[in-house]
């Protein structure tokens, strides 16, 4: 792919007007960014600051515990997925500031915007893995006692990452840079051109595998776990249960606009007014989905037992308490005791 290192005159003000007489002056429009783009920039800035710092802390705290604590493995992988996605934000931010001009070349166009989709698939597959782990702890405690170990957890994470990469490939392959003639601008986006069916297929697969199917399975999974929890009156685990629900719910809430607009755009003509309106909201939807990359550390902190008291402690210390303490609370993606607890204690807890 050519690298576009040319100077671009400032034609941001230009908006093509239909004129039969080509001698008539063209009306100029504002060179300012649209409101959705401004909102996207604000969200990106906040997500980048919170996401990089928060996830870096989570990685730092969990990395030392990952050898002996299974929950630390889950948290570590989720944090790595979020942290990786956050690294693309300065580039995406710069592009929006430049009215979506993409001066970073073809390779960056293929890789960087695909990171959020990699994050989506990695996160949901890891959440599914964690949920399966929670389910087994509740319903198959003896099996867990015999087979549930760090090695198996790492294998599960590797499978999740592998599948996530595999599912990201279509979007990666169809990303191209397009150099528009006027106003001079290089755009980074997906181009299916003749293959509208393939575009729809990719959007449907993304919606089903990255949203609807996980929503259905996780809802069923946590409904069963909730019923078991409530039937045994496990009051000690309700706070952590709220954390699990918060993490899973946040995933679906923040991905919803992106998924809805994505599926709609795949079924609309690119020149239709609805498509063009949705296209203007695209950056905002992406930024909204990006909130997922910074929300987990926030949930972990809020989930800390005796939260008010811990505010006096340093943030790494607080996160360590939340993520690695040997209690119900530290499992912020689950609501059972950690692996070092006995199975008897686990079954009592639920």
């Amino acid at each position: 792919m050519d690298s576009f290192n040319y100077t671009t005159p400032d034609y941001g003000h230009y908006d093509d007007k239909d004129t039969l007489d080509l001698n008539t002056p063209v009306d100029k429009t504002s060179n300012t960014l649209r409101v959705p783009d401004i909102l996207a920039l604000v969200i990106f800035a906040v997500v980048f600051l919170v996401g990089v710092l928060g996830n870096a802390l989570v990685v730092w705290v969990t990395a030392f515990e990952a050898k002996r604590t299974i929950n630390a493995i889950w948290f570590l992988n989720l944090a790595v997925a979020d942290f990786l996605s956050c690294l693309a934000l300065p580039i995406l931010f710069t592009s929006i500031v430049q009215h979506h001009h993409w001066p970073f070349g073809g390779a960056a166009c293929s890789i960087l915007p695909s990171l959020i989709l990699l994050n989506m698939y990695a996160s949901i597959l890891l959440l599914a893995t964690i949920s399966a782990d929670r389910f087994l702890l509740v319903f198959k405690p003896i099996w867990c006692q015999n087979f549930r170990g760090a090695g198996l957890a790492w294998i599960a994470c590797a499978v999740a990452w592998g599948l996530a990469l595999l599912l990201t490939i279509p979007s990666f392959l169809y990303r191209v840079v397009r150099e528009e003639y006027f106003p001079p601008k290089v755009l980074c986006g997906v181009d299916y051109s003749h293959d509208k069916r393939r575009e729809r297929a990719v959007a449907i697969v993304r919606l089903v595998l990255g949203f609807l199917w996980p929503l259905l399975t996780l809802t069923i999974c946590y409904t069963f776990i909730l019923l078991r929890t409530w039937s045994r009156r496990a009051t000690r685990s309700t706070k952590t249960l709220k954390v699990v629900v918060a993490v899973v719910a946040s995933f679906f809430i923040f991905w919803l606009p992106y998924q809805v607009t994505g599926i709609m755009m795949s079924f609309l003509e690119p020149s239709s007014p609805t498509f063009l309106l949705l296209k203007k909201l695209d950056s905002l939807c992406v930024s909204f989905a990006y909130i997922n990359c910074c929300i987990n550390p926030i949930i972990y902190v809020v989930a800390g037992q005796g939260f008010q008291g811990r505010l006096r402690k340093s943030l790494p210390s607080l996160l360590r308490n939340v993520l690695t303490e040997e209690s119900v609370v530290r499992e912020s993606k689950s609501f059972t005791r950690s692996t070092v607890d006995t199975m008897a204690q686990k079954t009592q807890a639920v």
Partner: antibody, heavy 123, light 112 residues
Amino acid sequence: QVQLQQSGAELTKPGASVKLSCKASGYTFTNYWMHWVKQRPGQGLEWIGYLNPSSGYTKYNQKFKDKATLTADKSSSTAYMQLNSLTYEDSAVYYCTRSGGDNYGNPYYFDRWGQGTTVTVSS
Amino acid sequence: DVVMTQTPLSLTVSLGDQASISCRSSQSLVHSNGNTYLHWYLQKPGQSPKFLIYKVSNRFSGVPDRFSGSGSGTDFRLKISRVEAEDLGVYFCSQSTLVPLTFGAGTKLEIK
């Protein structure tokens, strides 16, 4: 009325250079962009690039970046295209054509064309 | 580069008949501003090209209404409802959405 008058036919040897001219009349030269298009015998049209006479800004088709140089003389309302290191493949009819600029008309359409200049490269 | 594929390359019609020329682009020609910059030019024998239709379906000033353009995205069509003797020549589709600007190979319209 709007007219684009191009220079006469050129017969040159391989490796030489040639400078084609296109004199504009009937409109404000600096308000419109000047594009150059190549047409080989019996073939389609190829866009070489354009020049904004007002600012001197040029944009080339990557294919012609080392082949063509676009310039303009505002005082005489004339656009020029120099073709360097000519080969047999450069034998063609070259058209200058006008599009709206960033302030007048629309830069997307070629509404007026010159009559064309035939360039023949022969040893 | 955007490849513009015209079909047929040659077309022979009787006077008064309808002629239809197809043009397909290798990439979507929808600009980020929502417009589609697909145009049609006619080059009569021994002449320079003349501007016919801009942005898919808009006739340039002075172009008879028997000329009409249609299409969207990557597939476009030029129709001449009642062919007249003065319509013969080579018709080119062209795109100015993306750099470099590109043209189709041309469709030669001949009269029976």
